[in-house]
Amino acid sequence: SLLPVPYTEAASLSTGSTVTIKGRPLACFLNEPYLQVDFHTEMKEESDIVFHFQVCFGRRVVMNSREYGAWKQQVESKNMPFQDGQEFELSISVLPDKYQVMVNGQSSYTFDHRIKPEAVKMVQVWRDISLTKFNVSYLKR
Amino acid sequence: SLLPVPYTEAASLSTGSTVTIKGRPLACFLNEPYLQVDFHTEMKEESDIVFHFQVCFGRRVVMNSREYGAWKQQVESKNMPFQDGQEFELSISVLPDKYQVMVNGQSSYTFDHRIKPEAVKMVQVWRDISLTKFNVSYLKR
């Protein structure tokens, strides 16, 4: 069954945590649907963003952070492992120095921590996708 | 009650027709939600687009056409009559030489016909909005 989109969940992250998302683009790549995953510093959607991950399907991926309400310097990748019309599984793992983004089991993007992952309080998944799975796994202490 | 998004409906347009849309952005303007309305030449979403109208709420509006699979020259406007968090009523009227876009009863954008409006067979409304009303009114002959 489908999860609501935008999908918002409280989350606490640290090294070893993994966020897993399963979904499907709602339009063909020609029409450039988007997927966005935002790691927020508060439960409010207007809060700062520790890690912003935005896919323009078929075109590019941009990653950034929003600090004190202002976007910082964007990192862009043309790597496009997503398949037109196909379901995807996205996992974002918190490594000691960076986020590692896997698409369908393949390491596809990295983003260096600009803000401590421990500052994350909420994850939001939204834009032009249907969502079937959202999970945060925590490292066993 | 809410209409599904993306929302697709068969439509035949000509001078005097008006497409009316009521909805609300799904996110605060700081997060730049989008609204897109596309007038397609076929019932297929990958078909050409006679009139493409995309709002990046709080930032800008772009209008364009897609002909033989290729985007043409984009028209951009910084006019932003939409209100953060508020419901909007959008009406697109087919005038003899152009589309006139009204937002909350106020004339806000125009786009000269590049392709005959009679070529339109389908309208799609999508991206980051909830949709409560979609209507195509036809000129009484």
Partner: antibody, heavy 123, light 107 residues
Framework: ELQLVESGGGLVQPGGSLRLSCSAS????????MNWVRQAPGKGLEWVSG????????SYGESVKGRFTISRDNAKNTLYLQMNRLNPDDTAVYYC????????????????WGQGTQVTVSS | SSALTQPSAVSVSLGQTARITCQGG??????VSWYQQKPGQAPVLVIY???ERPSGIPERFSGSSSGDTATLTISGAQAEDEADYYC??????????FGGGTHLTVL
Amino acid sequence: ELQLVESGGGLVQPGGSLRLSCSASGFTFGAYAMNWVRQAPGKGLEWVSGVNSGGGLTSYGESVKGRFTISRDNAKNTLYLQMNRLNPDDTAVYYCAKSKRGAVVAGTGDDYWGQGTQVTVSS
Amino acid sequence: SSALTQPSAVSVSLGQTARITCQGGNFGRYYVSWYQQKPGQAPVLVIYKDSERPSGIPERFSGSSSGDTATLTISGAQAEDEADYYCQSGSSSDNAVFGGGTHLTVL
């Protein structure tokens, strides 16, 4: 042995320009972010500017923004700081420093520093 | 004036524990590092990412942070630890700021 050697300092009049260089050896220069830090006579450390490993992302301290430009040539293992519209407040020893990471992120540590080059702005 | 505030001087008896504080940062969000500088020398990194110690730095150096305060602790201070110490963190992730520095005297 890892080495950072700054050069290009000297005496310059207010309003003038200087270009500092930092020659790196003993490590894979293109894998790490680099920073410039300065220290005025008898004062504390002040971060000036940083550049990521690839050279595409740069950042600047408020006091130098719009006047200084950081750049790097990974093929030549060299970091640069172009300093324009210099004023007496820019008088300091300028250090180049290697970050522990590929990105410019405050607080993540600069593990190797050069010995510095003196810049004096005076008429 | 610095956005990060350090005491200008701290004294410690030989073999005792010295604590140097750094206040005014958003340490829940941004990392902090600490540098040691001796007269006429370049700074040396002693702590990074709040509490990590580079190789070659003695175990007596440790760091912690909470809220708006970060602390450098030297357990069993030695004569060679006499130096200036600077904290560094961010006013934003890409904009580093140093504290004003603390001179540690080992008595």
